[in-house]
Interface confidence: medium
C-alpha cells in the first residue's frame, strides 16, 4: 500500500476565536476559544493559546487581529506587532514564523479619532509533531475583541 | 474501500473577481464574475453572490477588497466592514464568518488627499451542503474596482 | 488505479522569504531565499523570483510585504502597489494575478513620523507546467526586510 | 559619490533676512528629505527644518524651499539677529529602505553666518 | 519635544580605551536613533543609523545598541582620530532633536 498521509485519516485543520479571554496582559500570548461557535480543532490540540500538532507536515497556518483605539495616547506603543510563533521543544525561546508591523494610530482623523485596523498573516511552515504555534501582539491592549470573527487563529496541512 | 473526500474527486475550490457589476448599490452582498479570466468554480457553484457549497467540509474561505477614496467626505462613514458571512436554510439571518474593519481614510496625507487600501481575510469554517458564502462591504462605494485582481473572493476546501 | 494528484506524491507546496538580496532596485521582481531558515521548496522551483511550476493545477499563491518609511519623502510614490503575476511562455508579457494598493505613508502622525505597514495577498489561480509567478512592488524601495518573517512569498496546490 | 555645496550671504545686519541655496550633486533629489542644521559658536547642534517641516522655535520665520528641476533647496530665516550668528549646514536624511533609514548621511561644508549691526 | 540627554557631556580618555556614552530619549523613539562624529571646524559625520547600523566606511570599532529610550555608543579601542565631540539624533517625530554633545579627550 502507498503511505500517503491524506488516504485514511482527516487532514489536519483548526479554527480558533477570539474570546474576553483572549487578553490576559501577562506578556503571554493571545488565549483562544476552540470549541464554541466557528471554533474547532481536527487533527491538531491547543495548550495554553497554542496550537499543537501532533502530525508532522507543511501546515499553512493564518491569524487575523482586529485592532481599533482612539487616537495614540502616551504609553501606547505607535508600532503594533502582530506574530505568529513556533514553540520547539529542541529550542529554549520561541521562534519566529510570521510577523508583521503596522503603525494604526495614524488611520485617525481630523474628524475622527476612532481607527480601526486589521492585520492579516498566512503562511506555510513545517511543524513537526509536538511544536506549537501560538499568537501574539504587541501592544495587545488594542486588540478589539467582539464576536470570535474579527481576531482568530489557524492552521491546516498542506 | 477507505472513504477519503480527496481520493478520487476533485477538491472543490473557486476564485471570483471583482468586475463591474459587482457594486450594485442595493444593500445586498458584492456580486461577482464566475468565468472570465482569472474566475472559476470547481466543485462549488455560484448564485447571486454566493459561493454555494455541493460537498461539506471545511473550507477555507478568502476576500480581497481594494478600497479607495479621496479624503472622507461627509456622509461616507470612517470605518469600513468588510465581512464573510453564512446564509443557511436552518437559520433566517446571515452569519458573520471572518469580519474586518478599517479606517482608510487616515491614509490620505498633506501632500496627496486621494488614499488606497487593502483588506484582506481568510479562515477555516465548516460548510454543509446548501449553505452559502457571501461577502459585504459597508460603505461599498469606496471599493474600488478595476480588473480583477484588486477585489476578489474564494474558497478551496482543507 | 483512480488518477489522483495526491494519491502518491506530495502535495507542491513553497514559502519564500525576504532576504537582504530580495531588492534589486532594477525594475525586476523581488529576489527571495528558498533554502535557509523557513524556506523550501516541495515540488515547485525557483529561478531568478519566480516560483516556477512543474505540475499543472490549482494553487493557492500568496505574499506578504513588510512595508516602513519615515514619512513620505519627494519622489517617492504616496501610493504602494504589491502584486502577483504570472509569466508564461504563450504570452509576452506579465499577467496580474492579485494586486493590492496602499498609502501607507498616511499613517504617519503628528507624534511619529515612522509608519510601519503591512501587505498580504491571497488566492487560487491555475497554473501550468512551466508558468512562473513572482512578487513585484512599486516603490520597492520602502519594502523592510529583516529575517525572513516580514516578507515572504508561497504557494500551495489545492 | 553625492556631495552638497552650500552659498549665501555671510554677514547680516539685524533684521535681514538670511538667504542659503544647497545644491545636491551626483545624487538623485527622490526618497530623500532634505535638511538644514545650525550650530552657534562652540555649542551643539539644532535643527531647523526640512520642506514642510520647522522647528517651532523658528516657524515662524523659516522658508525651506525646493527647486527640483535644479536639484536644489534653500533656506531663508528672516528677521535675523545676533542670536542667529552659527554655522548652517544642508545636510541629507536617508530615508529608503535601500539605503537605511534615520541618518543623516550626507553633509554641506557649512556656511558661518554672522549677524551684527 | 523629544528631549535627548547625552551623558557624560566629556570625558578622558587614552588610546586603546573602551569608551562608552549614552543617550536617553524622553519618550521611546524605537530604533529612530543616529550618532556623529564632528571635529572642530568641520560638518558632523555620519557613524551609526537606525540605533545599531555601521554607515559604509566607518571602522568597525564603532558600535551602536539600544531601542526604546536608552542608547549607546561604543568605541571598542580609541584611536587617535577619534578625539571628537559626538552627538546623538532622534528622528522619530518632529521636531528633530539633538543631544548635547560629549566631548571626548585625550587623557
Known amino acids: 500500500l502507498i503511505q500517503e498521509r491524506r488516504s485514511h485519516e482527516v487532514n489536519p485543520a483548526a479554527h480558533l476565536t477570539g474570546a474576553n479571554s483572549s487578553l490576559t496582559g501577562s506578556g503571554g500570548p493571545l488565549l483562544w476559544e476552540t470549541q464554541l461557535g466557528l471554533a474547532f480543532l481536527r487533527g491538531l490540540s491547543y495548550h495554553d493559546g497554542a496550537l499543537v500538532v501532533t502530525k508532522a507536515g507543511y501546515y499553512y497556518i493564518y491569524s487575523k487581529v482586529q485592532l481599533g483605539g482612539v487616537g495614540c495616547p502616551l504609553g501606547l506603543a505607535s508600532t503594533i506587532t502582530h506574530g505568529l510563533y513556533k514553540r520547539t521543544p529542541r529550542y529554549p525561546e520561541e521562534l519566529e514564523l510570521l510577523v508583521s508591523q503596522q503603525s494604526p494610530c495614524g488611520r485617525a482623523t481630523s474628524s475622527s479619532r476612532v481607527w480601526w485596523d486589521s492585520s492579516f498573516l498566512g503562511g506555510v511552515v513545517h511543524l513537526e509533531a509536538g511544536e506549537e504555534v501560538v499568537v501574539r501582539v504587541l501592544d495587545e491592549r488594542l486588540v478589539r475583541l467582539r464576536d470570535g470573527t474579527r481576531s482568530y487563529f489557524g492552521a491546516f496541512m498542506v | 474501500l477507505i472513504q477519503e473526500r480527496r481520493s478520487h474527486e476533485v477538491n472543490p475550490a473557486a476564485h471570483l473577481t471583482g468586475a463591474n457589476s459587482s457594486l450594485t448599490g442595493s444593500g445586498g452582498p458584492l456580486l461577482w464574475e464566475t468565468q472570465l479570466g482569472l474566475a472559476f468554480l470547481r466543485g462549488l457553484s455560484y448564485h447571486d453572490g454566493a459561493l454555494v457549497v455541493t460537498k461539506a467540509g471545511y473550507y477555507y474561505i478568502y476576500s480581497k477588497v481594494q478600497l479607495g477614496g479621496v479624503g472622507c467626505p461627509l456622509g461616507l462613514a470612517s470605518t469600513i466592514t468588510h465581512g464573510l458571512y453564512k446564509r443557511t436554510p436552518r437559520y433566517p439571518e446571515e452569519l458573520e464568518l471572518l469580519v474586518s474593519q478599517q479606517s482608510p481614510c487616515g491614509r490620505a496625507t498633506s501632500s496627496s488627499r486621494v488614499w488606497w487600501d487593502s483588506s484582506f481575510l481568510g479562515g477555516v469554517v465548516h460548510l454543509e451542503a446548501g449553505e452559502e458564502v457571501v461577502v459585504r462591504v459597508l460603505d461599498e462605494r469606496l471599493v474600488r474596482l478595476r480588473d480583477g485582481t484588486r477585489s476578489y473572493f474564494g474558497a478551496f476546501m482543507v | 488505479l483512480i488518477q489522483e494528484r495526491r494519491s502518491h506524491e506530495v502535495n507542491p507546496a513553497a514559502h519564500l522569504t525576504g532576504a537582504n538580496s530580495s531588492l534589486t532596485g532594477s525594475g525586476g521582481p523581488l529576489l527571495w531565499e528558498t533554502q535557509l531558515g523557513l524556506a523550501f521548496l516541495r515540488g515547485l522551483s525557483y529561478h531568478d523570483g519566480a516560483l516556477v511550476v512543474t505540475k499543472a493545477g490549482y494553487y493557492y499563491i500568496y505574499s506578504k510585504v513588510q512595508l516602513g518609511g519615515v514619512g513620505c519623502p519627494l519622489g517617492l510614490a504616496s501610493t504602494i502597489t504589491h502584486g502577483l503575476y504570472k509569466r508564461t511562455p504563450r504570452y509576452p508579457e506579465e499577467l496580474e494575478l492579485l494586486v493590492s494598493q496602499q498609502s501607507p505613508c498616511g499613517r504617519a502622525t503628528s507624534s511619529s513620523r515612522v509608519w510601519w505597514d503591512s501587505s498580504f495577498l491571497g488566492g487560487v489561480v491555475h497554473l501550468e507546467a512551466g508558468e512562473e509567478v513572482v512578487v513585484r512592488v512599486l516603490d520597492e524601495r520602502l519594502v523592510r526586510l529583516r529575517d525572513g518573517t516580514r516578507s515572504y512569498f508561497g504557494a500551495f496546490m489545492v | 559619490q553625492v556631495q552638497l555645496q552650500q552659498w549665501g550671504a555671510g554677514l547680516l545686519k539685524p533684521s535681514e533676512t538670511l538667504s542659503l541655496t544647497c545644491a545636491v550633486y551626483?545624487?538623485?533629489?527622490?526618497?530623500?528629505?532634505w535638511n538644514w542644521i545650525r550650530q552657534p559658536p562652540g555649542k551643539g547642534l539644532e535643527w531647523i527644518g526640512e520642506i514642510n517641516q520647522y522647528n517651532p522655535s523658528l516657524k515662524s520665520r523659516v522658508t525651506i524651499s525646493v527647486d527640483t528641476s535644479k536639484n536644489q533647496f534653500s533656506l531663508k530665516l528672516s528677521s535675523v539677529t545676533a542670536a542667529d550668528t552659527a554655522v548652517y549646514y544642508c545636510a541629507r536624511e536617508i530615508a529608503t529602505a535601500d539605503k537605511g533609514y534615520y541618518g543623516l548621511d550626507v553633509w554641506g561644508q557649512g556656511t558661518t553666518v554672522t549677524v551684527s549691526s | 519635544a523629544i528631549q535627548l540627554t547625552q551623558s557624560p557631556s566629556s570625558l578622558s580618555a587614552s588610546v586603546g580605551d573602551r569608551v562608552t556614552i549614552t543617550c536617553r530619549a524622553s519618550q521611546g523613539i524605537s530604533s529612530a536613533l543616529a550618532w556623529y562624529q564632528q571635529k572642530p571646524g568641520k560638518a558632523p559625520k555620519l557613524l551609526i543609523y537606525d540605533a545599531s547600523s555601521l554607515e559604509s566606511g566607518v571602522p568597525s570599532r564603532f558600535s551602536g545598541s539600544g531601542s526604546g529610550t536608552d542608547f549607546t555608543l561604543t568605541i571598542s579601542s580609541l584611536q587617535p582620530e577619534d578625539f571628537a565631540t559626538y552627538y546623538c539624533?532622534?528622528?522619530?517625530?518632529?521636531?528633530?532633536?539633538f543631544g548635547g554633545g560629549t566631548k571626548v579627550e585625550i587623557k
Open positions: 551626483g545624487g538623485s533629489f527622490s526618497g530623500y528629505y
Open positions: 539624533q532622534q528622528f522619530n517625530s518632529y521636531p528633530l532633536t
